[in-house]
């Protein structure tokens, strides 16, 4: 009969190296008498015989984990006991080798130009597996705007449009290889002007074109805006190229205006715009491209009708497309403006701006306008229109306006023929010889200060007298 | 509907001054707006402009001809006559006379059919 | 002086269009006028200042002017539109311009 013999742990449990999802096998062999029970823990937890992840063979002597998990790395131990002396105990490491893992790839990024991104690019492995990337098909170079952090993630400082590509993280270890998959990242830039519209001075009913070049990403979008209102008017042409965005906007011009290019792109929920204004101002008409170039006809408008001497002939200007039509737009423009001002500036004004859009024809071998005599657009401009007319001129400097006489294409008096050097040389406006009502009711009028500028009106049949300076007795 | 018709002699020898005469009718030669041309086409070749007179008298004239061009009129008759000096064989051509009209550009809305002047010894 | 210059001839076939030019420096600032001219027969203004149609002649006859050329356009040429076509400006001096002329061959 055998003596009874304490256990003794002949083979030492060893540290075991397993890569996941493989088998991982610890072998404990005890000598004893009687046999020993033996019990294996993991981390000091008791490791139960009814899991199915583990088998135990030989008398408990053989633990194998069938797949190993990168969760079972840990001290394993087991421990005979036969009830002959103490228990005995031998403990080895499980070390989980792991191919390179990548928990958490980079996904699709869009970034605004100038900002920071990050990549991410979480792995596991055992070894640590190390982490580089690639952008397109070449190894991406650290600097000092690009660095692959600690944790594997690309971090990207002052992003520039040449940032924007396909990337991919490459996680590798001695065990092998793991790639993600491709992401883009996608750098957006702020809409931006690059083509600014030009101001234009141009003669009523011109075509003129506007242009407004962008820049951004994604393309921005190009709006226009006409004096404050989207534009009603004209036709909008645009073409897209490399990223740049040209839109020309083309308009019949019948009145001044401020133009604003507007570029829009988006950035998620938010837009960036930008903006660029030109102005289109109308050039008094009668110096047109044509050198005041035209025929004459009679007037078969509507506005100005009252207004001009009938059956006389009146210069249209070939410098517009269609003269006649040209014209008396401009004049209905005109007549519109004219509702602002006062019940005693509108009738002299309306005669000045008849005779000045349609001006006499004067007689000779080439067709030519005969302007109005110097000395009745001062009259208008200093007696009946004083106050409208000052108050346009205080702020003709500051651009355009919304009411008044301001958009009215009304001449420029001091340039304007004198009747007294040649009185066949320039027109009279009738209005101001006949409705002397309208200055003689009005007594704060002829106690205005004459001008210098303005000599005596011409004696008429039916004269009326304003002041010493106006006098046209 | 303005009427201009030219007339004069069909021969003229070189040296010799060419007189010719273009009678409007239709409409008065003082009216304003209206000018009165002449344009000459020598044979096989383009328009030549020579002068004009306008409605009130004043009178203008080609460059190349100036030195021996005279245009003048005769308002009680209606008409107007152009005066060409020291005529040559390559003044042989047919003369026009036209109204230009301010109506349209002072282009030359009226013609007469022409009257053709040989300058030959 | 002042020269304009056009080809001295053009050939269009039946109902296509024609384009006959007029050349001269800066002809844009200027009223363009043409005129038909058939043989034997005086001249006939068929546009005035650049695109303008006297009553009478028919639609087909536009125009423009534009730079240093000016352009008779007949659109859809017709058997009667063969003829010698002449430009016409005046300039600044009081002194009127023409063309050489083109003759126009409708086939």
């Known amino acids: 009969e055998k003596l009874p013999k304490a256990p003794v742990i002949t083979t030492p449990l060893e540290t075991v190296d397993a890569l996941v999802e493989e088998v991982a096998t610890f072998m404990c062999a005890v000598e004893s008498y009687p046999q020993p029970e033996i019990s294996w823990t993991r981390n000091k937890i008791l490791i139960k015989l009814f899991d199915t992840r583990y088998s135990i063979r030989e008398n408990g002597q053989l633990l194998t984990i069938l797949s190993v998990e990168d969760s079972d790395d840990g001290i394993y131990c087991c421990i005979a006991n036969n009830g002959v002396g103490g228990a005995v105990e031998s403990c080895g490491a499980l070390q989980v080798k792991m191919k390179p893992k990548i928990t958490r790839p980079p996904i699709n990024v869009k970034i605004i130009e100038g900002l920071k991104a990050v990549l991410p690019c979480t792995t596991m492995g055992n070894p640590k597996p190390s982490v580089s990337w690639i952008k397109g098909d070449n190894a991406l170079r650290e600097n000092s705007r690009i660095a692959v952090l600690e944790s594997g993630s690309l971090r990207i400082h002052n992003v520039q449009k040449e940032d924007a590509g396909q990337y991919r993280c490459v996680a590798k270890n001695s065990l092998g290889t793991a790639y993600s998959k491709l992401v883009k990242l996608e750098v957006e830039v702020f809409a931006r002007i690059l083509r600014a519209p030009e101001s234009h001075n141009v003669t009523f009913g011109s075509f003129v074109t506007l242009r407004c070049t962008a820049i951004g990403i994604p393309v921005p979008t190009i709006s226009w805006i006409e004096n404050g209102n989207a534009v009603s008017s004209g036709s909008i042409q645009e073409s897209v190229k490399d990223r740049v965005i040209d839109s020309r906007l083309q308009l019949f011009i019948t009145k001044p205006g401020l133009y604003t290019c507007i570029a829009t792109n988006k950035h998620g929920e938010k837009f960036s715009t930008a903006k660029a204004a030109a102005t289109v101002s109308i050039a008094e008409w009668s110096k047109s491209q044509k050198d005041s170039q035209g025929y004459c006809a009679q007037y078969r408008g509507e506005v100005c009708d009252a207004v001009l001497a009938k059956d006389a002939l009146v210069f249209f200007n070939t410098s517009y497309r269609d003269p006649e039509d040209a014209q008396e737009l401009l004049i209905h423009t005109a007549w519109n403006e004219l509702k602002a001002v006062s019940p005693l500036c509108r009738p002299a004004a309306e005669a000045l701006l008849c005779n000045h859009l349609f001006q006499e024809c004067s007689p000779g071998v080439v067709p030519t306008p005969m302007p109005i005599c110097r000395e009745y657009c001062l009259a208008v401009k200093e007696l009946f229109c004083a106050k409208e007319w000052q108050a346009m001129e205080g702020k003709a400097h500051r651009g355009l306006y919304r009411s008044g006489m301001h958009l009215l294409p009304v001449p420029e008096c001091s340039k304007l023929p004198s009747m007294h050097r040649d009185p066949t040389a320039c027109t009279r406006l009738p209005y101001l010889d006949y409705k002397k009502e309208n200055i003689t009711t009005f007594p704060s009028i002829t106690s205005s200060r004459p001008s210098a500028d303005i000599p005596n009106l011409p004696a008429s049949t039916s004269s009326f007298a304003v002041s010493p300076a106006y006098s046209m007795t | 509907q303005v009427q201009v018709q030219e007339s004069g002699p069909g021969l003229v020898k070189p040296s010799q001054t060419l007189s010719l005469t273009c009678t409007v009718s239709g409409g008065s030669i003082t009216a304003r707006y209206y000018s009165w041309s002449w344009i000459r086409q020598p044979p096989g070749k383009g328009l030549e402009w020579m002068g004009v007179i306008a409605y009130d008298g004043s009178t203008y004239y080609s460059p190349s001809l100036k030195s021996r061009t005279s245009i003048s009129r005769d308002t009680s008759k209606n008409q107007f006559s152009l005066h060409l000096s020291s005529v040559t064989p390559d003044d042989t051509a047919v003369y026009y006379c036209?109204?230009?009209?301010?109506?349209?550009?002072?282009?030359?809305?009226?013609w007469g059919q022409g009257t053709q002047v040989t300058v030959s010894s | 002086s002042y020269e304009l210059t056009q080809s001295p001839s053009v050939s269009v076939a039946l109902r296509q269009t024609a384009k006959i030019t007029c050349g001269g420096d800066?002809?844009?600032?200027?009223?363009a006028q043409w005129y038909q001219q058939k043989p034997g027969q005086a001249p006939v203004m068929v546009l005035y200042a650049d695109s303008r149609r006297p009553s009478g002649i028919p639609e087909r006859f536009s125009g423009s002017n534009s730079g240093n050329t000016a352009t008779l356009t007949i659109s859809g040429a017709q058997a009667e539109d063969e003829a010698d076509y002449y430009c016409h400006v005046w300039d600044s001096s009081t002194n009127a311009w023409f063309g050489g002329g083109t003759h126009l061959t409708v086939l």
């Open positions: 036209a109204r230009g009209s301010s109506r349209v550009a002072a282009a030359f809305d009226s």
């Open positions: 800066n002809i844009g600032s200027k009223n």
